[in-house]
């Protein structure tokens, strides 16, 4: 079975900078899985943001600002990355990755 690890416990960024979060997949080939990213803002319910499927298709939640989030995967390191552009107050949250095994 697949296992996920988010090596960064926290990431502190200056306003307007870029944050890059990592999710390391083990126990399964990342190319055979879909990785989902979620956000949990303080005091709010968890929200789906973006996913990248086994075939590389990216799906974004409607209502998420265009250009704010970028998702990628690096098969060589078995890692999915979530890039948050122009970090601002609304981006303060806990970010989770999740796995869907095909």
């Amino acid at each position: 079975a697949g296992h996920l690890e988010q090596p960064q416990i926290s990431s502190t960024k200056t306003l307007s900078k870029t944050a890059r979060l990592e999710c390391v997949v083990s126990g399964i080939t990342i190319s055979a899985t879909s990785v989902y990213w979620y956000r949990e803002r303080p005091g709010e319910v968890i929200q789906f943001l973006v996913s990248i499927s086994y075939d590389g298709t990216v799906r974004k939640e409607s209502g998420i600002p265009s250009g704010k989030f970028e998702v990628d995967r690096i098969p060589e390191t078995s890692t999915s990355t979530l890039t948050i552009h122009n970090v601002e107050k609304q981006d303060i949250a806990t970010y989770y990755c999740a796995l869907w095994e095909v």
Partner: antibody, heavy 125, light 109 residues
Framework: EVQLVESGGGLVKPGGSLRLSCAAS????????INWVRQAPGKGLEWVSS????????YYADSVKGRFTISRDNAKNSLYLQMNSLRAEDTAVYYC??????????????????WGQGTMVTVSS | EIVMTQSPGTLSLSPGERATLSCRAS???????LAWYQQKPGQAPRLLIY???SRATGIPDRFSGSGSGTDFTLTISRLEPEDFAVYYC??????????FGQGTKVEIK
Amino acid sequence: EVQLVESGGGLVKPGGSLRLSCAASGFTFSSYDINWVRQAPGKGLEWVSSITSSSYYIYYADSVKGRFTISRDNAKNSLYLQMNSLRAEDTAVYYCARDLGVRGVDYYYYGLDVWGQGTMVTVSS
Amino acid sequence: EIVMTQSPGTLSLSPGERATLSCRASQSVSSSYLAWYQQKPGQAPRLLIYGASSRATGIPDRFSGSGSGTDFTLTISRLEPEDFAVYYCQQYGSSPPYTFGQGTKVEIK
């Protein structure tokens, strides 16, 4: 001195348009979320719209959605509210107001800590 | 939409008395996202309390906020002449609108 100054109010006919401006000074404008709040004569406060520091997140009250557009120019330290298809019920004093900003490492607070003096918008035939 | 209901509508008190203003939300609001404002005639509102209980810069300690979930309170321990005004609560929820209460007027008895 930390300051917000609104301008652009006036008398307009129903169905008309108006563009409000809000000039900021005394603080790093590009680091703050900004809101528009209005107050009809003799009534309470009504939140209208907000825009985050980098303009990615924009929100509107249902009463103005599709008619009003909020924008900002961080290089000019300015906030704008384009108001189209104006109605009599849009008659109010319009305030721009600054959000508190980040107040913690893994959380944030909300509150409007700096307000302009307001600009009056009257919609009447 | 979260509806904020303030009570009472008007509070008639004398200087030196204690004022207790209530704000009730139609659904739970995070304490971090609850603010109180004071507004005097012809003036813009002034932030008093943010995060339900933190005083804004320059606000005297006779003003205090408390509460959580759906019930929040603004207390003025000893009313000064300059405290007679209209007070509003406002919530910032997980999605707009960021509604204000209808206001409580504190007037001189």
